[in-house]
Interface confidence: medium
């Protein structure tokens, strides 16, 4: 269950680092959303190798992706898993380690010389084969740092948000991904109640801009669950 995954996100005692200062003893630290990691020993830290619950790739490290730990496992329980090295099987770019991307279900090198012409091809073809995923979230590493000399403007093809200019994010549009504007206050946003639901979006929205969060519009509280309107609102 999700609770058991959350509870197993243990805190371990580590030896004091050389010259290392410490967090304030006895303080409690909360993770958003909703996970509490109590402080205590000065040199405690969250064990990076324990299951780390996630809802999307961006919540994991750049060398990880978010998925169910078991094949065909409970879709509601997802954790950060180590990225896959070259020539390993994949279903989307985020599964492949930095410097690689997913092509025809295999992690391949994102060599500058041949990759540029394949961006759109791989995004579109991955939808039509056995490994279709709609490329859930953008690749988060140095995958395309060499390819894009200037940041993508609105409408430019991208793989991840850092490929886009400031104020834009990389979001799905039909079967490819393009730079779209980050949402402003009052704009309709998408709140994913269940992991996996964003895989159904053909026209993905950006996230809310800085200082905003996606919340139910106040006058829509009475509406049924399925029709509740979410908008970007100030924290």
């Amino acid at each position: 269950t999700l609770n058991s995954v959350l509870n197993s996100n243990a805190i371990k005692n580590l030896p004091p680092p050389l010259g290392g200062a410490a967090g304030h003893p006895g303080s409690a630290v909360s993770a958003a959303p909703g996970i509490l990691y109590p402080g205590g020993n000065k040199y405690q830290t969250i064990d990076n190798y324990q299951p780390y619950p996630c809802a999307e790739d961006e919540e994991c490290g750049t060398d990880e992706y978010c998925a169910s730990p078991t094949r065909g496992g409970d879709a509601g329980v997802q954790i950060c898993l180590a990225c896959r090295k070259r020539r390993k099987r994949c279903m989307r770019h985020a599964m492949c380690c930095p410097g690689n991307y997913c092509k025809n279900g295999i992690c391949v090198s994102s060599d500058q010389n041949h990759f540029r012409g394949e961006i759109e091809e791989t995004i579109t073809e991955s939808f039509g084969n056995d490994h279709s995923t709609l490329d859930g979230y953008s690749r988060r590493t140095t995958l395309s740092s060499k390819m894009y000399h200037t940041k993508g403007q609105e409408g430019s093809v991208c793989l991840r948000s850092s490929d886009c200019a400031s104020g834009l994010c990389c979001a799905r549009h039909f079967w490819s991904k393009i730079c779209k504007p980050v949402l402003k206050e009052g704009q309709v946003c998408t709140k994913h109640r269940r992991k996996g639901s964003h895989g159904l979006e053909i026209f993905q929205r950006c996230y809310c801009g800085e200082g905003l969060s996606c919340r139910i519009q106040k006058d829509h509280h009475q509406a049924s669950n399925s029709s509740r309107l979410h908008t970007c609102q100030r924290h």
Partner: nanobody, 125 residues
Framework: EVQLVESGGGLVQAGGSLRLSCTAS????????VGWFRQAPGKEREFVTG????????YYADSVKGRFTISRDNAKNTAYLQMNSLKPEDTAVYYC??????????????????WGQGTQVTVSS
């Protein structure tokens, strides 16, 4: 090598707001965890809040939860700390720090590699 520069500190009345900025030079910033720590006179430096490489995951000390908000703009190589409903006990030097890890699991000082010089925040009652 990443260099961090904090700005936005100052004197504010209790109940007021301040917004701190942490601007980084160096490429590693956009793929690393960023945290804010603070040190009040005569006290240890303590963790305030942290954010993972993408901004999708944030952590807060209980003492600031609901009042402080951390965010980042990787395109501008900048992290922000919005501090609302400030209290006199929030008075401290606030430090921005960046770690090598991309995950927001770094809650303690020794997990951070690069540090700013700090900016003073004083909350008067």
């Amino acid at each position: 090598e990443v260099q961090l520069v904090e700005s936005g500190g100052g004197l504010v009345q209790a109940g007021g707001s301040l917004r701190l900025s942490c601007t980084a030079s160096g490429r590693a910033f956009s793929s690393s965890v960023v945290g804010w720590f603070r040190q009040a006179p005569g006290k240890e430096r303590e963790f305030v809040t942290g954010i993972n490489w993408s901004g999708a995951r944030t952590y807060y000390a209980d003492s600031v939860k609901g009042r402080f908000t951390i965010s980042r703009d990787n395109a501008k190589n900048t992290a922000y700390l919005q501090m609302n409903s400030l209290k006199p006990e929030d008075t401290a030097v606030y430090y921005c720090a960046s770690g090598r890890d991309s995950r927001a699991r770094a809650l303690f000082e020794y997990e951070y590699v690069w540090w700013g010089q700090g900016t003073q925040v004083t909350v008067s009652s």
